[in-house]
C-alpha cells in the first residue's frame, strides 16, 4: 500500500528572464527514493536524478536548467513559453511511483511574485 504523499510548491509565478525553483517533497513513507524524473507539460523530460548515477539534464534544457536544491530543479532565463504544468515523478522502493504537479506562470510584469507553499533548505 502506498502511504506517502507528495507536497509541491503548487501554483507559482515568476518574472520573465528570472529563475524559479521547482520543488517536490515526499513524506509519510519510509520508501527509498531511487530516482526522480522532472517533466514538462508536454511530457518532455527536463532532468533525471538517479541515486547511483546522479543528475542528467536533457540536452534541450542544459543551458537553462540547474539541478537542485536537493531533488528539486531550478529553471533559469524564463520565457513566456515556460508557462504550464511541471511534474515530478518519484520512483521509490518498494512503494512504486509517486507523482506531483506544479503550475508555473511566467509573467511579463515586474511585480511577479515567486510564491511557494514551502521551501526545502
Amino acid at each position: 500500500m502506498m502511504t506517502g504523499t507528495i507536497e509541491t510548491t503548487g501554483n507559482i509565478s515568476a518574472k520573465k528572464g528570472g529563475s524559479v525553483i521547482l520543488q517536490c517533497h515526499l513524506s509519510s513513507t519510509m520508501a527509498q527514493v531511487t530516482q526522480v524524473n522532472w517533466e514538462q507539460h508536454d511530457h518532455s523530460l527536463l532532468a533525471i536524478r538517479n541515486a547511483e548515477l546522479g543528475w542528467h539534464i536533457y540536452p534541450a534544457f542544459k543551458d537553462r536548467v540547474a539541478p537542485g536544491p536537493g531533488l528539486g530543479l531550478t529553471l533559469q532565463s524564463l520565457t513566456m513559453n515556460d508557462t504550464g504544468e511541471y511534474f515530478c515523478t518519484y520512483h521509490t522502493y518498494p512503494d512504486g511511483t509517486y507523482r506531483g504537479r506544479i503550475f508555473l506562470e511566467v509573467l511579463e510584469s515586474s511585480v511577479a511574485e515567486h510564491s511557494a507553499r514551502f521551501q526545502i533548505p
Partner: antibody, heavy 120, light 107 residues
Framework: QVQLVQSGSELKKPGASVKVSCKAS????????MNWVRQAPGRGLEWMGW????????AYAQDFTERFVFSLDTSVTTAYLQISSLKAEDTAVYYC?????????????WGQGTLVTVSS | DIQLTQSPSFLSASVGDRVTITCRAS??????LAWYQQKPGKAPRVLIY???TLQSGVPSRFSGSESGTEFTLTISSLQPEDLATYYC?????????FGQGTKVEIK
C-alpha cells in the same frame, strides 16, 4: 565488481542470538535498498523485509516483526541481520539481496547465504 | 496482501522441450514481477524483471510474458544446466513476496 559477501555458518542453541553480516563492495551501499530473504531446509524463498540504506530505517514482513532486526554500518559498508531468542524453526539459510534501482525493481545481486542452525 | 500462485510446483521434461511456468497474482501488479533461478546449494539469480526484460547475461532461451495478472516464464529449449527451482516475485509494494517455486527436473 559488485559483491555481497556474508558471514560464515552459525550453530546456536535455542534462546541464543545470532548476527549475520553482509559486506557490500563495488558500489555505494547507501544508494540501493537491501533485502533479507530466508530459506528453510527444503523450502522456498521468504522475503523477510528490507532496510532503507539511505535513512537506516528497516521494514519487516509480517512473520518477521518480533525477533528480527535489520541494521547498517555504513562506515564498513555492511548490513546486518540479528535474530534473538532463536528457535529450532529459525534454522535456515539467510540471504541478503540488493534491489536494482531501475524503475522496475528486482534483486540483482545476492550474498552467498549464511546457514544458521539452531539445535540443542 | 497480494498473493502469488505459482504452477506447477514440479515438472519433469526432456532436453530440448519447451517449458512453461505460470505465476498468478491475486490483484494487478502492473509489470512489477521478476523471475529467479536457484540451482541446488546456490543463491538465486534473476532471469527476468519487469515481467518481460531479460537480465544481462541470461541465455535468450528464457523469456517472460504477461497477460493481466498472469505471468509466464518460458524456457524455449530446456538444457541440462536448467535443472533448478524457479521463483516469481512481486515488487510493486510491501511485502515483496515470492511464489512457492517450481522445481524443474530433467528426464
Amino acid at each position: 565488481q559488485v559483491q555481497l559477501v556474508q558471514s560464515g555458518s552459525e550453530l546456536k542453541k535455542p534462546g541464543a542470538s545470532v548476527k549475520v553480516s553482509c559486506k557490500a563492495s563495488g558500489y555505494t551501499l547507501t544508494n540501493y535498498p537491501m533485502n533479507w530473504v530466508r530459506q528453510a531446509p527444503g523450502r522456498g524463498l521468504e522475503w523477510m523485509g528490507w532496510i532503507n540504506t539511505n535513512t537506516g530505517s528497516p521494514a519487516y514482513a509480517q512473520d518477521f516483526t518480533e525477533r528480527f532486526v535489520f541494521s547498517l554500518d555504513t562506515s564498513v559498508t555492511t548490513a546486518y541481520l540479528q535474530i534473538s531468542s532463536l528457535k529450532a524453526e529459525d534454522t535456515a539459510v539467510y540471504y541478503c539481496a540488493r534491489t536494482a534501482i531501475t524503475s522496475v525493481y528486482h534483486f540483482d545481486y545476492w550474498g552467498q547465504g549464511t546457514l544458521v542452525t539452531v539445535s540443542s | 496482501d497480494i498473493q502469488l500462485t505459482q504452477s506447477p510446483s514440479f515438472l519433469s521434461a526432456s532436453v530440448g522441450d519447451r517449458v512453461t511456468i505460470t505465476c498468478r497474482a491475486s490483484q494487478g501488479i502492473s509489470s512489477y514481477l521478476a523471475w529467479y533461478q536457484q540451482k541446488p546449494g546456490k543463491a538465486p539469480r534473476v532471469l527476468i524483471y519487469g515481467a518481460t526484460t531479460l537480465q544481462s547475461g541470461v541465455p535468450s532461451r528464457f523469456s517472460g510474458s504477461e497477460s493481466g495478472t498472469e505471468f509466464t516464464l518460458t524456457i524455449s529449449s530446456l538444457q541440462p544446466e536448467d535443472l533448478a527451482t524457479y521463483y516469481c516475485q512481486k515488487l510493486n509494494s510491501h511485502p515483496c513476496s515470492f511464489g512457492q517455486g517450481t522445481k524443474v527436473e530433467i528426464k
